[in-house]
């Protein structure tokens, strides 16, 4: 009896694992084995596919074959008993194009209201992704074990921290990798669960902001209790993306070690140009808080996001405010090459009640003022980029008296 060729061959590639699956064409024939050959582009001869010779099952693994993953290859299969079937040729394919990203390795650490997630590729030193190791981004799904309500977080890197969680609560999550450059979305990791700890006695510092004054950076934060000491650490932001580098630790900012106020001042030359992460920790001598949320700090934007300069034209019931470019030392205007929005705060000189206007325009009207009354105005600029949510310090307050009645035209 003539043996029929096997049919419906599927090639599954996950990371560096190459698996072939196929259907027997004749289930009634026993003791059949199967063998594969492969052929590289531009070659005429077929080569025996190691790992896939004389296979009795309908699955084989040819991961040991050292292929150029960017080069097209062709496969063929035949059945063998006393005689052999004709060859069945599989459509040619490029391993890299066909490959799926496997589940990443996930490692969790818990705090009281945060989980630290460390993600690394599932296959160490993968040949398939050798040129893309630093291009992986990850997305995750997280849920409270008790509720099952899922939250998705996209575009994270190899180290990520999720804040604002509940203490003593079990959270579960799964992570998948993506290579956006190749439009590849990976397979989810197994589900990992971790319980957050009891609530820490000391909360972390909050609302960290960086501003520029003279040649210094001023770092400010809020804290619940008095008589504390604080320390501030920094890290290059790009290191979050690099899963293979174990060498970079958070570093102290020398002028911000053991400070007793909720701010510290350090020279601009502490940081070269770049994007950094900053974090703050509080201590009362016996206990230490967990680290604050990390804030992103871009020296380029920070250095040049100066408070706006403005002129006021006073009318009886309003001010017209004209916002200009801030001046550097030497009185040259600073060119802001990114869009800004302006926050204008004004108040009656004799009162503490502040009112606020947010405007994208550089000419702003402050309405509903009383005649012959002194009002004070201060302003600051914000970047409109969500990721680099930066603000200048407020300008000095300028106080002006409104005109007598009937001069509003």
């Amino acid at each position: 009896k003539n043996l029929k060729s096997p049919q419906k061959v599927e090639v599954d590639i996950i990371d560096d694992n190459f698996i072939l699956r196929w259907n027997r064409s004749d289930e009634s024939v026993g003791n059949v084995t199967f063998s594969f050959d492969y052929q590289k582009t531009g070659m005429d001869n077929w080569i025996k596919l190691s790992g896939c010779q004389n296979i009795t099952s309908t699955k084989c693994n040819f991961s040991s074959l050292k292929l150029n993953v960017y080069e097209e290859i062709k496969l063929r299969i035949r059945a063998e008993k006393e005689n052999t079937s004709s060859w069945y040729e599989v459509d040619s394919f490029t391993p890299f194009r066909k490959a799926q990203i496997g589940p990443p390795e996930v490692h969790l650490e818990a705090e009281d209201k945060a989980i630290v997630i460390h993600i690394s590729p599932g296959t160490k030193d993968s040949v398939m992704w050798a040129l893309d190791g630093l291009s992986f981004t990850y997305s995750l799904v997280i849920w409270k074990n008790s509720s099952g309500v899922e939250e998705r977080i996209e575009n994270i890197y190899s180290r990520h921290k999720i804040y604002k969680l509940s203490p003593e609560t079990t959270y579960c999550l799964k992570v998948k990798a993506a290579l956006l450059t190749s439009w590849k979305i990976g397979v989810y990791s197994p589900v990992h669960c971790i319980k957050t700890t009891v609530e820490n006695e000391l909360p972390p510092p909050e609302n960290i902001e960086v501003s520029v004054q003279n040649q210094n950076y001023v770092l400010k934060w809020d804290y619940t209790y008095a008589n504390m000491t604080f320390q501030v650490q920094w890290l290059h932001a790009f290191l979050k993306r690099n899963p293979g580098n174990h060498l970079y630790k958070w570093k102290q900012i020398p002028d911000c070690e053991n400070v007793k106020t909720t701010q510290c001042v350090f020279p601009q030359n502490v940081f070269q140009k770049g994007i950094y992460l900053l974090r703050v920790q509080a201590s009362d001598g016996n206990n230490t808080s967990f680290w604050s949320e990390e804030i992103k700090f871009d020296t380029e934007i920070q250095a040049f996001l100066l408070p706006p300069v403005f002129n006021i034209r006073s009318l009886s019931d309003s001010f017209h405010i004209y916002i200009g470019a801030p001046k550097q030392s030497g009185n040259t205007p600073v060119i802001q090459d990114y869009p800004l929005i302006y926050e204008i705060i004004f108040w009656e000189n004799t009162s503490n009640a502040e009112r606020k206007i947010i405007e994208k325009k550089t000419d702003v009207t402050v309405p509903n003022l009383k005649p012959l009354t002194v009002y004070c105005v201060k302003a600051r600029a914000h970047t409109m980029d969500e990721k680099l949510n930066k603000s200048s310090v407020f300008s000095d307050a300028v106080c002006e008296k409104t005109k007598p009645g009937n001069t509003s035209k």
Partner: antibody
């Protein structure tokens, strides 16, 4: 496999200098920080600090600032610990330990240890 | 500095026992705790990291638990080769600190 091979035992007098070496093999030396841990006789383990094997920058724990120096011979995949002006309390076994973490380092535990080098200080 | 306290310096055990070694941190360190085994004349071996994750090649009779300030290493079915010193270590904050150790002895 991954190994850290330390230099042999040392007998020194107070005031002398000792240099201990730790040769790494089986992994890329400049990818992982090297830490040093002290164990005095009958005592527990005490972390001394670490050296960035890529930049050569050392970080010392407060108790080990001054007479202690970490250095590298990168081409030989070797980290060194030098103790100057030896004192009686320096008598201990010193371990080099490679970080076991697979992510940057505010989370550092030790997956690979050297066998330890015993330093005896005696006049 | 964060102090790691192992209150029991010595523990007497027999083969087949279930043994629990405790470690207390002077402040909340989350789950950033590792456990090591040290036998005489040998270097320490990592058993557990992240409070409860077993390191590669460690037998599954070793389990770690706890978070915050209280941590436990449990050996579910004590073997003679498990007679050793056991140390905990916190790695939430620098300087990294170890417990003083608990020595398992034969009853």
């Amino acid at each position: 496999q991954i190994q850290l091979v330390q230099s042999g035992p040392e007998l020194k007098k107070p005031g002398e200098t000792v240099k201990i070496s730790c040769k790494a093999s089986g992994y890329t030396f400049t990818n992982y920080g090297m830490n040093w841990v002290k164990q005095a006789p009958g005592k527990g383990l005490k972390w001394m600090g670490w050296i960035n094997t890529y930049t050569g920058e050392p970080t010392y724990s407060d108790d080990f600032k001054g007479r202690f120096a970490f250095s590298l011979e990168t081409s030989a995949s070797t980290a060194n610990l030098q103790i100057n002006n030896l004192k009686d309390e320096d008598a201990a076994t010193y371990f080099c330990a490679r970080e076991g973490a697979i992510y940057y380092g505010d989370y550092v535990y030790f997956g690979v240890w050297g066998a330890g080098t015993t330093v005896t200080v005696s006049s | 500095d964060i102090v790691m306290t192992q209150s029991q310096k010595f523990m007497s055990t027999s083969v087949g026992d279930r043994v629990s070694i405790t470690c207390k941190a002077s402040q909340n360190v989350g789950t950033a705790v590792a456990w090591y085994q040290e036998k005489p004349g040998q270097s320490p071996k990592l058993l557990i990291y992240s409070a409860s994750n077993r390191y590669t090649g460690v037998p599954d009779r070793f389990t770690g638990s706890g978070s915050g300030t209280a941590f436990t290493l449990t050996i579910s079915n004590m073997q003679s080769e498990d007679l050793a010193d056991y140390f905990c270590q916190q790695y939430y904050n620098y300087p990294l600190t170890f417990g003083a150790g608990t020595k398992l002895e034969v009853k």
